[in-house]
Interface confidence: medium
């Protein structure tokens, strides 16, 4: 019998260029008579053009929704009702070819062609893209608040904020033909629920979405997005009602930046330079293609690429890479944004060099990618350390902390977190090394204590990059480095003269002069520690709630002991900058550290002094007794304390703590407390210091109060941010 053919709606979006008309500002106002008149003519022309081709039998509807420069560009969509079996045959490319063919066939024709009655359409300026019914609905929902803007070369155009009576607005942006548009979004409120989506075309086509951002992101307070060409659309969807624009948008045309380079590396190890996508840190554009060719001076070396918060992974099958595609020596890899450092190590087998290609495979892009490149010794990639094959990083070996996700850095250790005697491979505790007392059979623990040694897990690296054998030599009153750098920056970690309350838990004035109280509207929220004249360190999770993210809310008190009263040694500061660790992850508490820059430098006194920061190699031995201080609750669920409390806690081996917390303890965490519980940090202590006293009498910052199960519960220790695990970031910021 006869079977009705199934028809489907195929939606197309596009633009065409009219050579005999000019754009005017009237055409940006949808309510103007010029706009209504021009759309009527343009609609008619579009319909006639389509119906002049074999697509005519499938024509369903069409609409011209906007105009732009060039001399006049019309932006439109149309729907064809086509038999299902022909759907794939009528791709946007095929439809565009049919329409262009029609236009070309009448260019020199003297015959009357309906669609050419008023418009001279440029065949080369026709663009047809795939769209969907959903895209058209999204477009229509913005037409009540539709803004077209043309931005000329050398201009930076600040866009007018959205109409708050509308629920959605669209900015249609256009620039000069051979340039690309760069959009800058700056969030101006601490919290909002607004949503912004950027498209690589004139309208909100889902398949051409570059990126979407949501809700006054603190992780990215400023976002710069590149289009692949001179057209872009930005769609705003209203969040909470607000009389203030929660963001500022500005746009500028920029020239295409070539992303090709030929480099020859020097005969030295470590980082030698940086490769990045165009206009880094802007998001890379949807049609980015970078090709970097690096020549290595000798086959002794391999090439290392060090990424920041970005990793390369093998992609299963031929699925597209959603966060950038890489080809390195014909190996296809996909980029993946992660909250960790990562290195890709490329063995070199031929002197021809290495070509690295980066491509954005889909229109969806992401933050610009930057990679540091350098050489490593292929026979010894990590001198004195362990090469973690999971992430390509060199990590300390046998220090009692599983730095590598697979834990191999702590396997097959002859001596874990101890010193290995040369004579018989027995293990002695680290504080016994270079202490003037031979503990190994033939005294190998006391050899080479006055000279440079190869760098390793527990050696201290001097400023001149040489290493010394003595563990924890910083600020012990005796220069161990040739350049004396182990005794620099030592105006720290000394307690003020204090009349201690013997056996008590209440601290006295000047006892912990680095202790900070971080307050909002006169209420103590978190602890912190002074580490430099203008910097206080605390926990990132103190700023977890959007309402706590603004610097203007916070006041930092130093030299404080009592919450309900002030004394002469106390000083307060406003916060000029708040920096959370870029890898901080709220759910896992990893990298739970933040830095506050004070609005003016501290004046040091007996009551206000910084604590000493440990070197990355500083070893805080499990079993060591250290101290935590804070105004936190005195019992689980209780109110905060009026007096600054102090309590001694014991450092716990990482493996045991990891077991207790079911392997949620990362290498950036350190545990302290007691198996019986009782002594612990609690709510309100967050961000406060865990300090350990060195033999020199100076106090070093070992940790920051981070998390734990309850307070003082048996079998559950307090978990602290391990300062040695984040020290390189701290130093990078503070210096």
């Amino acid at each position: 019998g006869y079977k009705a053919e199934v028809m489907v709606s195929q939606v197309y979006s596009g633009s065409l260029r009219v050579l005999n008309r000019h754009f005017s500002q009237d055409l940006t106002r949808r309510e103007s008579s010029a706009f209504r008149s021009e759309t009527a003519k343009a609609q008619k022309m579009l319909k006639e053009l389509i119906t002049s081709t074999r697509l005519g039998t499938y024509y369903n509807s069409s609409s011209v929704y906007s105009f732009g420069e060039g001399p006049l560009t019309c932006f439109f969509w149309f729907i064809l009702q086509i038999p299902e079996h022909r759907r794939l045959m009528l791709s946007p490319e095929v439809v565009q070819a049919l329409l262009v063919e029609e236009l070309l066939s009448t260019v020199n024709s003297s015959a009357a062609v309906p669609y050419r009655a008023e418009y001279e359409v440029d065949p080369e300026g026709l663009v047809i893209l795939e769209a969907s019914v959903k895209d058209i609905a999204a477009l229509n929902s913005t037409l009540g608040c539709y803004r077209y803007s043309y931005v000329g070369q050398g201009q930076v155009l600040r866009l007018k904020g959205p109409d708050h009576l509308a629920s959605s607005c669209l900015w249609h942006l256009q620039g000069p033909k051979d340039l690309m548009l760069k959009l800058r979004l700056e969030w101006t409120l601490a919290e909002c629920r607004d949503r912004l989506a950027m498209y690589d075309v004139a309208g909100p086509l889902e398949k051409r979405l570059i990126t979407s951002v949501y809700g006054c992101s603190r992780q990215e307070p400023v976002v710069e997005v590149l289009a692949s060409g001179a057209i872009m659309a930005v769609v705003w969807k209203k969040g909470l009602h607000s009389y203030y624009d929660p963001f500022v948008l500005s746009v500028q045309p920029v020239v295409f930046q070539a992303c090709e380079v030929n480099l020859t590396l020097d005969n030295r190890l470590d980082s030698q330079g940086v490769l990045s996508t165009p206009y880094f840190p802007s998001y890379y554009s949807p049609q980015t293609h970078c090709s970097w060719h690096l020549t290595v001076p000798s086959l002794d070396y391999g090439l290392a690429l060090w990424f920041d918060a970005y990793a390369l992974r093998r992609q299963k099958y031929d699925l597209p890479c959603t966060q950038g595609q890489w080809t390195i020596q014909n190996r296809r890899l996909c980029g993946l944004r992660i909250l960790q450092p990562y290195a890709e190590r490329i063995p070199v087998v031929a002197t021809a060099g290495i070509t690295i290609n980066f491509t954005s495979q889909i229109s969806l892009t992401g933050p610009g990618v930057r990679v540091h490149y350098g050489l490593y010794n292929q026979s010894d990639p990590c001198p004195g350390e362990f090469l973690c094959s999971v992430n390509g990083l060199c990590v300390p070996a046998c220090d009692g902390v599983k730095d590598c996700p697979n834990g191999l850095d702590e396997r097959n250790c002859v001596c874990r977190a101890t010193f290995q005697c040369k004579e018989d491979s027995t293990c002695i505790s680290l504080p016994k090394v270079c202490d003037g007392q031979p503990d190994c059979l033939n005294g190998s623990d006391e050899e080479q204590c006055q000279e440079g040694v190869p760098c390793g897990t527990f050696t201290f690296q001097c400023e001149d990059r040489s290493c010394v054998k003595k563990p924890n030599p910083q600020c012990d009153g005796r220069p161990d480095c040739r350049d004396g750098s182990d005794e620099e920056h030592c105006d720290c970690g000394l307690q003020g003269p204090s009349s201690r309350i013997v056996g008590g838990a209440v601290s006295s004035e000047g006892e912990w002069p680095w202790q900070a109280s971080l307050q909002v509207r006169g209420r103590h929220i978190c602890g912190g520690a002074l580490i430099a004249d203008r910097w206080v360190i605390t926990a990132a999770h103190c700023f977890q709630e959007d309402s706590m993210a603004s610097t203007v809310l916070w006041t930092v008190f130093l030299g404080k002991v009592w919450q309900n009263s002030r004394w002469p040694g106390e000083v307060s500061f406003k916060v000029s900058r708040l920096l959370l660790h870029p890898y901080h992850e709220e759910d896992s508490h990893d990298y739970d550290v933040a830095l506050l820059q004070l609005d003016h430098p501290v004046v040091r006194s007996a009551a206000v002094r910084p604590v000493c920061l440990p070197a990355r190699s500083h070893f805080f031995e499990p079993g060591l007794h250290c101290w935590i201080t804070g105004w936190g609750a005195l019992r689980e669920g209780g109110p905060i304390s009026n007096a600054l409390q102090k309590v001694d806690v014991q450092l716990i081996p990482q493996d045991l703590c990891s077991e207790v917390y079911r392997y949620q303890v990362t290498p950036r965490m350190l545990c302290a407390g007691y198996r019986k519980g009782k002594k612990d940090a609690c709510q309100g202590d967050s961000g406060g210091p865990l300090v350990c006293k060195a033999l020199s009498g100076r106090w070093f910052l070992a940790g920051l109060v981070s998390w734990g199960l309850g307070c003082g519960r048996p079998n559950y220790f307090g978990v602290y941010t391990r300062i040695t695990g984040v020290i390189s970031w701290i130093q990078q910021v503070v210096t």
């Epitope: 702590e410 396997r411 097959n412 874990r416 977190a417 014991q650 045991l656 077991e659 007691y674 019986k676």
Partner: antibody, heavy 124, light 110 residues
């Protein structure tokens, strides 16, 4: 004097059950992890179970898991081992031992006080 | 969990030193610094001699010393005396709150 005294051993048929007790004195019982360790006559020591002071962490050797149950009553300063489905290979001298005392509450996994043991003989 | 490996016997003359070995795996002796040594005289309960690889409980003479290298722990008894004749057992923490013992070494003072 710090002391641990085991009791409850005896001759028992295979497949049956037996309950061992360990009475503690001379120290703060509820501040210590307590272990059961057994020794087959003329053979070595075998750890079989341990229990934390609050009974919230309990562990068993694979050889007894599912058959033996450790428990404690801090009010009575007593430790127990309920042994079900006994086998001939469970024949041994059963010791209870406390974890090493320390100045601070820390992990040691070492036993500094032992009882004299109670003998369990399982006949097949 | 399998037992740690100890040599069945060792001997030495009075005044001499004897070193006992205890071999485990990278998951127990090799991984944790929780190796203990016990001495047991016939018919008596074991006595703790060393904990945490090399620490001596109070009352244990300093003739007894412990050390560790890779997956092997050692107990050295120097200045051997007649009363040191006994069975010696090592133990190690093996993760997940479990403890594993060695098979024991019989020390004879010649």
């Amino acid at each position: 004097e710090v002391q641990l005294v085991e009791s409850g051993g005896g001759l028992i048929q295979a497949g049956r059950s037996l309950r061992l007790s360990c009475a503690a004195s001379g120290f703060t019982f509820d501040e210590h992890v307590i272990y059961w360790v057994r020794q087959i006559p003329g053979k070595g020591l075998e750890w079989i179970s341990s229990i934390s002071w609050k009974s919230d962490i309990i562990a068993y050797a694979d050889s007894v898991k599912g058959r033996f149950t450790i428990s404690r009553d801090n009010a009575k300063n007593a430790l127990y081992l309920q042994m079900n489905s006994l086998r001939a290979e469970d024949t041994a001298l059963y010791y209870c031992a406390r974890e090493k005392d320390g100045d601070f509450y820390y992990y040691y996994f070492a036993m500094d006080v032992w009882g004299q043991g109670t003998t369990v003989t399982v006949s097949s | 969990q399998s037992a740690l490996t100890q040599p069945p016997s060792a001997s030495g003359s009075p005044g001499q030193s004897v070193t006992l070995s205890c071999t485990g795996t990278s998951s127990d002796v090799g991984y944790y610094n929780y190796v203990s040594w016990y001495l047991q005289h016939p018919g008596k309960a074991p006595k703790l001699m060393i904990y945490e690889v090399s620490k001596r409980p109070s009352g244990v003479p300093d003739r007894f010393s412990g050390s560790k290298s890779a997956n092997t722990a050692s107990l050295t008894v120097s200045g051997l005396q007649a009363e040191d004749e006994a069975d010696y057992y090592c133990s190690s923490y093996a993760g997940s709150n479990k403890v594993v013992f060695g098979g024991g070494t019989k020390v004879t003072v010649l």
